[in-house]
């Protein structure tokens, strides 16, 4: 399947529009600080070069790898050293080390200004004036802030973004039409980015086998009627797609994702009965739809798992001679029977099964040793079930905001060394599990909740990796991908933590809080709550609740005052003094 010119091959496969968009995403994800205009210039140069290769694949440099071509282009940026510091050293390396070097410098939390949404009329004017630039800017701004965003999926988001403006800029009430659509895209985009970040972390930190195991479990739940060989083929192809995207090979990734969607739709009869609608859609919608498709119904009369995985005389032989196949079959068979389990739970069960076989197979009576292996699964299943039950009860009792606050306190006490913005962001996201999952019936709660928590805790792990401050976080993040959530759940209050010095400035608020959105105001209050816990880690729930209630009343009072700033100054001093007294600071 070798092509004389890889760049020509991808240009022809993807078409000019997608080619340009994907190169822009790739460049923005690597050089996150570069101005938009610089990236557009680089993309245009690459595109013109690609066209010369399409015309003549034997033309000079057309035989070079995409990494070589793109890397050479990125290394022409004049301000590389000033803007990126040591990342400029990547340019002294040869491929593939140069690309690895660029990948290592991707920043999950780049120092970029918050995206402020202009007025609707301003956006509509910009959209009409230059639609192409407007949409490119969207790709650029998302890609540089989310350097692992799944590129072919970002093309889908851009298509929806364009559709929203096309429709709403002609509407009578532009804002009423557009703003909810943009909010939905923003929230879905953040979720999509976080989900993809976990896939990349899984591949990069735990290896291909970890990702494949995840994919076997998930696809077996989704396609329980498909044969193991079919699931294995899909897993192999899906792994290739995500390996490419996570490795910065976005053209190959998008091309292979399109091929995979085509294959799935051509073979839907042997995969799933739920694919029909997806397969009638255009490419980007089709791929997205397949990725989100509901689980197919389980085949009737599936036999007991015990026959093949406990009772068979060949269990140990099959395990020893091909662990990947045998354990893959175990995972497939277990997952297709259990759409009610989270993927991480299924992987824990498979690991327990593997560990038991490894311990038992060399024993004098292997069968006697592993006969009760399924009994070992019971506590593993009950632990997330109980945790979800307790937390959904708490969520229903408190509501989302107060549930987030309970988690903020819980996690700040567990890992108080973590930065306040990270604790706020992660705990707020952890708290969203309530409204996202607790509404579901029992059979859907665990896959929703625990797999979502895996995504959120991965955010904590990648942010912490950038500036590690807590050995406990490092341990939970690196020891086992599937046991991250149980590891964090098991953490108690960090008794070694020396409370933070009290700083009145941290608790000084101004009138600008009154003009903030409800969400921003919540974040301010939650930031104060984390700081309180860092000052007084032994504070009780009741103490913290009293202080937070006083704080909410103080904000409400001063925002109603005529002279807001004076109110914040005077009442703020009183509040700080009262809080110090209440907490014994």
């Amino acid at each position: 399947d070798a092509h004389k010119s890889e760049v020509a091959h991808r240009f022809k496969d993807l078409g000019e529009e997608n080619f340009k968009a994907l190169v822009l995403i790739a460049f923005a994800q690597y050089l996150q600080q570069c101005p938009f205009e610089d990236h557009v210039k680089l993309v245009n140069e690459v595109t013109e070069f690609a066209k010369t290769c399409v015309a003549d694949e034997s033309a000079e440099n057309c035989d070079k790898s995409l990494h070589t071509l793109f890397g050479d282009k990125l290394c022409t940026v004049a301000t590389l050293r000033e803007t990126y510091g040591e990342m400029a050293d990547c340019c002294a390396k040869q491929e593939p080390e140069r690309n690895e070097c660029f990948l290592q410098h991707k920043d999950d939390n780049p120092n970029l200004p918050r995206l402020v949404r202009p007025e609707v009329d301003v956006m509509c004017t910009a959209f009409h004036d230059n639609e192409e630039t407007f949409l490119k800017k969207y790709l650029y701004e998302i890609a540089r802030r989310h350097p692992y965003f799944y590129a072919p999926e970002l093309l889908f988001f851009a298509k929806r973004y364009k559709a929203a403006f096309t429709e709403c800029c002609q509407a009578a009430d532009k804002a009423a039409c557009l703003l909810p659509k943009l909010d939905e895209l923003r929230d879905e985009g953040k979720a999509s980015s976080a989900k993809q970040r976990l896939k990349c972390a899984s591949l990069q930190k735990f290896g291909e086998r970890a990702f494949k195991a995840w994919a076997v479990a998930r696809l077996s739940q989704r396609f329980p009627k498909a044969e193991f060989a079919e699931v294995s083929k899909l897993v192999t192809d899906l792994t290739k797609v995500h390996t490419e995207c996570c490795h910065g090979d976005l053209l190959e990734c998008a091309d292979d994702r399109a091929d995979l969607a085509k294959y799935i739709c051509e073979n839907q009869d042997s995969i799933s009965s739920k694919l029909k609608e997806c397969c009638e859609k255009p490419l980007l919608e089709k791929s997205h739809c397949i990725a989100e498709v509901e689980n197919d119904e389980m085949p009737a009369d599936l036999p007991s798992l015990a026959a093949d995985f406990v009772e068979s005389k060949d269990v140990c032989k099959n395990y020893a001679e091909a662990k990947d196949v045998f354990l893959g079959m175990f995972l497939y068979e277990y997952a297709r029977r259990h759409p009610d389990y989270s993927v991480v739970l299924l992987l824990r069960l498979a690991k327990t099964y593997e560990t038991t076989l490894e311990k038992c197979c060399a024993a004098a009576d292997p069968h006697e040793c592993y006969a009760k292996v399924f009994d070992e699964f019971k506590p593993l299943v009950e632990e997330p079930q109980n945790l979800i039950k307790q937390n959904c009860e708490l969520f229903e009792q408190l509501g989302e905001y107060k549930f987030q606050n309970a988690l903020l306190v819980r996690y700040t006490k567990k890992v108080p060394q973590v930065s306040t913005p990270t604790l706020v962001e992660v705990s707020r996201n952890l708290g969203k599990v309530g409204s996202k999952c607790c509404k579901h019936p029992e059979a859907k709660r665990m896959p929703c909740a625990e797999d979502y928590l895996s995504v959120v805790l991965n955010q904590l792990c990648v942010l912490h990796e950038k500036t590690p401050v807590s050995d406990r976080v490092t341990k939970c993040c690196t020891e086992s991908l599937v046991n991250r959530r149980p590891c964090f759940s098991a953490l108690e209050v960090d008794e070694t933590y020396v409370p933070k010095e009290f700083n009145a400035e941290t608790f000084t608020f101004h009138a600008d809080i009154c003009t903030l959105s409800e969400k921003e105001r919540q974040i301010k209050k939650q930031t104060a709550l984390v700081e309180l816990v860092k000052h007084k880690p032994k504070a009780t729930k009741e103490q913290l609740k009293a202080v937070m209630d006083d704080f909410a009343a103080f904000v409400e009072k001063c925002c109603k005052a005529d002279d807001k700033e004076t109110c914040f100054a005077e009442e703020g001093k009183k509040l700080v003094a009262a809080s110090q007294a209440a907490l014994g600071l």
């Epitope: 140990c316 395990y319 020893a320 001679e321 662990k323 990947d324 311990k359």
Partner: antibody, heavy 121, light 110 residues
Framework: EVQLLESGGGLVQPGGSLRLSCAVS????????INWVRQAPGKGLEWIGI???????FYATWAKGRFTISRDNSKNTVYLQMNSLRAEDTAVYYC???????????????WGQGTLVTVSS | DIQMTQSPSSVSASVGDRVTITCQSS???????LSWYQQKPGKAPKLLIY???KLTSGVPSRFSGSGSGTDFTLTISSLQPEDFATYYC???????????FGGGTKVEIK
Amino acid sequence: EVQLLESGGGLVQPGGSLRLSCAVSGIDLSNYAINWVRQAPGKGLEWIGIIWASGTTFYATWAKGRFTISRDNSKNTVYLQMNSLRAEDTAVYYCARTVPGYSTAPYFDLWGQGTLVTVSS
Amino acid sequence: DIQMTQSPSSVSASVGDRVTITCQSSPSVWINFLSWYQQKPGKAPKLLIYEASKLTSGVPSRFSGSGSGTDFTLTISSLQPEDFATYYCGGGYSSISDTTFGGGTKVEIK
């Protein structure tokens, strides 16, 4: 003290056969997996195969067919039967126990002192 | 085909030196099924490290192992006279039949 002791090595002609023994003392062999590993003069280690406590055997791909591992728990001994020997089979042959609690992992905690097999005409 | 490549094949070092030996596997070993052995002339190998980083009982703490997947390292933090020997890595794979050792690294006195 646990000991593994290989015997049965010596000079053998190409095409010939040899049976090596690994006598185990200090533990009940019936509970453990035993491996055979060889080392050609001045070369590295090469895994030959394993026999589990249950008697199930597995071999390196290259060893299948010519080499057979067996055990006699009553004698606390494991055997390596080698057929159609070639000059390149000349090596010190070791028996080694797999660390208890593992079945397929390359963790061998107790080794014999080795027995030299020379294949030459 | 399974490849277990050890490097360097030999290293000259002095007492007190830090010595690092690497082992590269293709394909990746089964979930950290990697061991390190020490062998002195005329003697049987001795298991130092298993599961890539766990020290066998009685092995001095100056020995440490790290790595996962395809790349592994054995480090001797401060070489002692009794550490001059040949070191082998051993890898386990999806199939037990693929159990393999690296080519060895001889640690010699400088």
